[in-house]
C-alpha cells in the first residue's frame, strides 16, 4: 500500500492532524524533499551573519559573514574574525607573524618563508610578514665566469633597417 505522504511535494509536509493531507510549510520553515512529515526550521542569518539567500518553502536560508569576518565550516556555520595580512588569529586575537613567517591573506596562519637553499637557490627578495621570500638563481649561476642567460635582443623600432 502506497504511503499517502509520498505524494506531498517539497515545500509541504504530511499533516497527521489533518488526515495526512499535504499542508504548506508554515512561515520560517521549509522542506527540501517530498514526503516529509515535518518542515525544518529556517536558519536565521543574524548578528555577525548576513543573509546571502532567503529561506523559501523548499530551501533553507544561506548565510555569509558581515565585513571583517569570514565563513568557516560547512554552509558558513561560523564567522571568524579577519586579521590583516602579516597577522594570524590566535585565542588572544590578531597577532603579527613571527620573524621568518608570513601570511598574505586576511585569514589562516603564518607560514614559514621558503628556504631557498633547499632548492640550491639564493634569496632574490627578502621575505616580510606579508610576503614570502623570492628565490633567485642558484649561487653557482651568479659566480664570476659562469655562463649567464643572454638577455633577449631589443625589439627593432619600425622604420629602422638593420645596419
Amino acid at each position: 500500500l502506497q504511503d499517502p505522504c509520498s505524494n506531498c511535494p517539497a515545500g509541504t509536509f504530511c499533516d497527521n492532524n489533518r488526515n495526512q493531507i499535504c499542508s504548506p510549510c508554515p512561515p520560517n520553515s521549509f522542506s527540501s524533499a517530498g514526503g516529509q512529515r515535518t518542515c525544518d526550521i529556517c536558519r536565521q542569518c543574524k548578528g555577525v551573519f548576513r543573509t546571502r539567500k532567503e529561506c523559501s518553502s523548499t530551501s533553507n536560508a544561506e548565510c555569509d559573514c558581515t565585513p571583517g569576518f569570514h565563513c568557516l565550516g560547512a554552509g558558513c556555520s561560523m564567522c571568524e574574525q579577519d586579521c590583516k595580512q602579516g597577522q594570524e588569529l590566535t585565542k588572544k586575537g590578531c597577532k603579527d607573524c613571527c620573524f621568518g613567517t608570513f601570511n598574505d591573506q586576511k585569514r589562516g596562519i603564518c607560514r614559514p618563508w621558503t628556504n631557498c637553499s633547499l632548492d640550491g637557490k639564493s634569496v632574490l627578495v627578502n621575505g616580510t610578514k606579508e610576503r614570502d621570500v623570492v628565490c633567485g638563481p642558484s649561487p653557482a649561476d651568479l659566480s664570476p665566469g659562469a655562463s649567464s642567460v643572454t638577455p633577449p635582443a631589443p625589439a627593432r623600432e619600425p622604420g629602422h633597417s638593420p645596419q
Epitope: N28, R43, Q44, K46, G47, F69, C79, Q81
Partner: antibody, heavy 118, light 111 residues
Framework: QVQLQESGPGLVKPSETLSLTCTVS????????WSWIRQPPGKCLEWIGY???????NYNPSLKSRVTISVDTSKNQFSLKLSSVTAADTAVYYC????????????WGQGTTVTVSS | QSVLTQPPSASGTPGQRVTISCSGS????????VNWYQQFPGTAPKLLIY???QRPSGVPDRFSGSKSGTSASLAISGLQSEDEADYYC???????????FGCGTKLTVLG
Amino acid sequence: QVQLQESGPGLVKPSETLSLTCTVSGGSISGYYWSWIRQPPGKCLEWIGYIYYSGFTNYNPSLKSRVTISVDTSKNQFSLKLSSVTAADTAVYYCTRDHSHYYYMDVWGQGTTVTVSS
Amino acid sequence: QSVLTQPPSASGTPGQRVTISCSGSSSNIGSNTVNWYQQFPGTAPKLLIYSNNQRPSGVPDRFSGSKSGTSASLAISGLQSEDEADYYCAGWDDSLNGPVFGCGTKLTVLG
C-alpha cells in the same frame, strides 16, 4: 552539559564601573553568541548586549555608550563592563548562551545581584 | 516599556487550557521567530519554546507555541499547579540587531 557562572562584586558605588565575568564550563565558547541580560527588582528582562565568540559585538542602544563586552576564548570566559552606574542599574545580571543559527537563549547562568549604592 | 507586549497576568484552574499572547511589530515577530521563557521566583529564566513552536527536550507537550503575523501565543493545556510562574516572549528585532523581550505574564493557577 554547558553551565554558566557569573562572578563579580555585588555592590558598586554610583559613578563607578560595574564589572562581571561569565565562565563557561562543560563546553566550548566557539560558535555561539554570548549575552548579558539584566532584570531590575520586579521589572522586565532587558538585553544589554552580546558578543560572538570571534569578537563581533552589539549593544542595546539605550546602554551602548556605557557598555563593553569582551571575550577570552583561552579562558572560556566573557565579561561585561558598565560604566557610570546609577541606582537604576541595580538588577540581577544574567549571562546566556545564544544559538547562532536560530537565535534563542538555551543556557542561562543562575544570575548575580548587583546593587548600586554608596 | 518593552518592545513586545504581553498581558501582565493570566490565570486558570488545574486541568484548564490557558493562552498567553505576545504582540510585536514587523521588525521583530513579523519577520523573525519567537521564543518563550519560563521563570520561577528567584531563579533564572529557562527556555520553554523556541522557533515559534519547538520544544527543547524535557519540556512537556502540554506547552505549545504559535505565531501569526506580528503576534504570537503560548498555550498551556492541562494546567498544573507547578506551571505557576512568569512567562516571557522574546525574539530577534532587525532594527535593534538584537533580541527583545516582553515584560512577562504572571500565570496564577487557582484553587
